[in-house]
């Protein structure tokens, strides 16, 4: 058993049928010595008396808010949560496996640049009685500071019969140098509590591996005289690290017909312009990627050929 | 990534082309190592990230772009003298650079070259003959060093009398390649910045 926060405790249980569970001793936070009784949640049934209460915690029915009283007055509370260990592996019931980029990916994180700011998000089908708390650091043995905000509900989607909820959090490394070569990964730890169930999820990454630039901005077409060709031009996104000559991007320019089956013409360039043939009803899209370290491509920025 | 490669024109900053070749070569070598050594811990998540140049060179600090010198987090151990030698310094354009920058890059390359050659000698003794260093990568390191044209004492190749542990050697190869790829990215950024300055 360990303390998650003041008066909230997590009991770790080896979770299998007929498991013996864990013996837990609760102590009433009071100078009083006698006349103390204990109850669980809203029940008035007295579970025991005395300054300490010993309970055998086996199932969720044994978890909850234990309260010690004296003469009708509440003295203190202890909330017990359960953390299930199933065959040596901590349960992952609360969050959905996003399966990207690999199985057992519960937290996904992205950064728009090398400033040390990043966003993580996760999915759940649970809509109520759910709380998250996020901590982060650079490295784990001698951790350096990363400050995270509060997790917020950022999207709701309908997936078949189920509703899916996306939560996200923004974090910022306290002293980040964009040009630094990372040798210790960022660690992100999310505590999730659903009713009386506690779970924790972690992700470990280098900022360089989660970079995903914003799409190029100011995408424009300039028709070339007496030709079906157009000059496409764009600019680096505002959110990308500067100077751009040091943090350079490379670009992919795509001409896509109206039908998805039509052949796509693609050109790769390090410049911020390209000359392409603009077909009728086609659209031109441009996306960006770090020129020197192949992390994710940005989303496409698009304009119609017409 | 198969991108069209532009051939640098002669007036271009002389080292840019070599640094691009270096990054391509080390990335290819790392990919080959990860495929060949699939049963070894060779991914970024599995290896310890060690920098053999740590406390010996200060490439990131010495080659920091001017715009980032205002960022206190980037100024841990920044030196402040200016570069005056080295053939990559094609013009006064690079006068903003600190004395350490290109010589620091040269020292990095020299250290990695020695490590890779020593490692290759060990790998050639492996009866499994599972993996060797790409000669193209070694050649590209050499070309960039020649283009940098710094005079420095030659570091003798380390020779080891004891029987090599091939498992450990292959893991060390992965660690070296990951670190060298990160340094090659920094070198490419620096060369690109110098070229634009």
């Amino acid at each position: 058993i360990w303390e998650l926060k003041k008066d909230v405790y997590v009991v770790e249980l080896d979770w299998y049928p007929d498991a013996p569970g864990e013996m837990v001793v609760l102590t009433c936070d009071t100078p009083e010595e006698d006349g103390i009784t204990w109850t669980l949640d809203q029940s008035s049934e007295v579970l025991g008396s005395g300054k300490t209460l010993t309970i055998q915690v086996k199932e969720f029915g044994d978890a909850g808010q234990y309260t010690c009283h004296k003469g009708g007055e509440v003295l203190s509370h202890s909330l017990l949560l359960l953390h299930k260990k199933e065959d040596g592996i901590w349960s992952t019931d609360i969050l959905k496996d996003q399966k990207e980029p690999k199985n057992k990916t519960f937290l996904r994180c992205e950064a728009k640049n090398y400033s040390g700011r990043f966003t993580c998000w996760w999915l759940t089908t649970i809509s109520t009685d759910l709380t998250f708390s996020v901590k982060s650091s650079r490295g784990s043995s001698d951790p350096q500071g990363v400050t995270c905000g509060a997790a917020t509900l950022s999207a709701e989607r309908v997936r078949g019969d189920n509703k899916e909820y996306e939560y996200s959090v923004e974090c910022q490394e306290d002293s980040a140098c964009p040009a630094a070569e990372e040798s210790l990964p960022i660690e992100v730890m999310v505590d999730a509590v659903h009713k009386l169930k506690y779970e924790n999820y972690t992700s470990s990454f280098f900022i360089r591996d989660i970079i995903k630039p914003d799409p190029p901005k100011n995408l424009q077409l300039k028709p070339l005289k007496n030709s079906r060709q157009v000059e496409v031009s764009w600019e680096y996104p505002d959110t990308w690290s500067t100077p751009h000559s040091y943090f350079s991007l490379t670009f992919c320019v795509q001409v896509q017909g109206k039908s998805k089956r039509e052949k796509k013409d693609r050109v790769f360039t390090d410049k911020t312009s390209a000359t392409v043939i603009c077909r009728k009803n086609a659209s031109i899209s441009v996306r960006a990627q770090d020129r020197y370290y192949s992390s994710s491509w940005s989303e496409w920025a698009s304009v119609p050929c017409s | 990534r198969n991108l069209p490669v532009a051939t640098p024109d002669p007036g271009m900053f002389p080292c840019l082309h070599h640094s691009q070749n270096l990054l391509r070569a080390v990335s290819n070598m790392l990919q080959k190592a990860r495929q060949t050594l699939e049963f070894y811990p060779c991914t970024s998540e599995e290896i310890d990230h060690e920098d053999i140049t740590k406390d010996k060179t200060s490439t990131v600090e010495a080659c920091l772009p001017l715009e980032l010198t205002k960022n206190e987090s980037c100024l841990n151990s920044r030196e402040t003298s200016f570069i005056t030698n080295g053939s990559c310094l094609a013009s006064r354009k690079t006068s903003f650079m600190m004395a350490l920058c290109l010589s620091s890059i040269y020292e990095d390359l020299k250290m990695y070259q020695v490590e890779f050659k020593t490692m290759n000698a060990k790998l050639l003794m492996d009866p499994k003959r599972q993996i060797f260093l790409d000669q193209n990568m070694l050649a590209v390191i050499d070309e960039l060093m020649q283009a940098l044209n710094f005079n420095s004492e030659t570091v003798p190749q380390k020779s080891s009398l004891e029987e090599p542990d091939f498992y450990k050697t292959k893991i060390k190869l992965c660690i070296l390649l990951h670190a060298f790829r990160i340094r090659a990215v920094t070198i490419d950024r620096v060369m690109s910045y110098l070229n634009a300055s």
Epitope: D14, W15, Y16, P17, D18, A19, E59, F60, K85, E86, D87, G88, I89, D93, K102, N103, K104, T125 | F39, P41, E46
Partner: antibody, heavy 115, light 112 residues
């Protein structure tokens, strides 16, 4: 004490269907994940499928994906395996089993797929 | 397809020490716990070892398990005639959990 009693096995022709049941008692069935495991005659153990305690997630071996469906009725304390498009290679003893560091197995039920 | 490899058979005379190996990889045994089962003819598997080296109550202490790196082993010290059975190791793969990964199985024969 924990008990898992299986039923539903038998002889079936290729291409036909069969449903296996596993009745649980002696524990809070709705709190635990459950597996199906099979063993072809003279062969080793092969995992078939898993279902979460609340039925929210199901996992299948590639060899049965799209043909077999694992389900549970927590009100009846029963686990099911619906098997469709049966093949000769599905012939095996099928076991249900609890998920956890200490597990409990059903007695097994024989499924024979033969024309 | 079995990812955990066991020897097809091992044998020993009563009182001898018999060991069965179970070889896997970094993503299964290297990252997860190992269990061992004993299966007597015509019966369901019985749990002998869980959590690499833990014995459930009721399992004789002549059975012991261990794990090192990407391999695990089961030892029977002082093998007895009633130990003649098939033995299976089981683990998980970190990418496919909760799918159970079973070993290929080992037939233990007690000679004499």
């Amino acid at each position: 004490q924990v008990q898992l009693v299986q039923s539903g096995g038998g002889v079936v022709q290729p291409g036909r269907s069969l449903r296996l049941s596993c009745a649980a008692s002696g524990f809070t069935f709705s709190s635990y994940g459950m597996h199906w495991v099979r063993q072809a005659p003279g062969k080793g153990l092969e995992w078939v499928a898993f279902i979460r305690y609340d039925g929210s997630n199901k996992y299948y071996a590639d060899s049965v994906k799209g043909r077999f469906t694992i389900s549970r009725d927590n009100s009846k304390n029963t686990l099911y395996l619906q098997m469709k498009s049966l093949r000769a290679e599905d012939t095996a003893v099928y076991y249900c089993k609890t998920h956890g560091s200490h597990d409990n197995w059903g007695q097994g039920t024989m499924v024979t797929v033969s024309s | 397809s079995y990812v955990l490899t066991q020897p097809p058979s091992v044998s020993g005379t009563p009182g001898q020490r018999v060991t069965i190996s179970c070889s896997g990889g970094r993503s299964n045994i290297g990252s997860n716990n190992v269990k061992w089962y004993q299966q007597l003819p015509g019966t369901a598997p019985k749990l002998l070892i869980y959590g690499n080296d833990q014995r459930p109550s009721g399992v004789p202490d002549r059975f012991s398990g261990s794990k090192s790196g990407t391999s695990a082993s089961l030892a029977i010290t002082g093998v007895q005639a009633e130990d003649e059975a098939d033995y299976y190791c089981q683990s998980y793969d970190r990418g496919t959990h909760p799918a159970l990964l079973f070993g290929t199985g080992t037939k233990v024969t007690v000679l004499g």
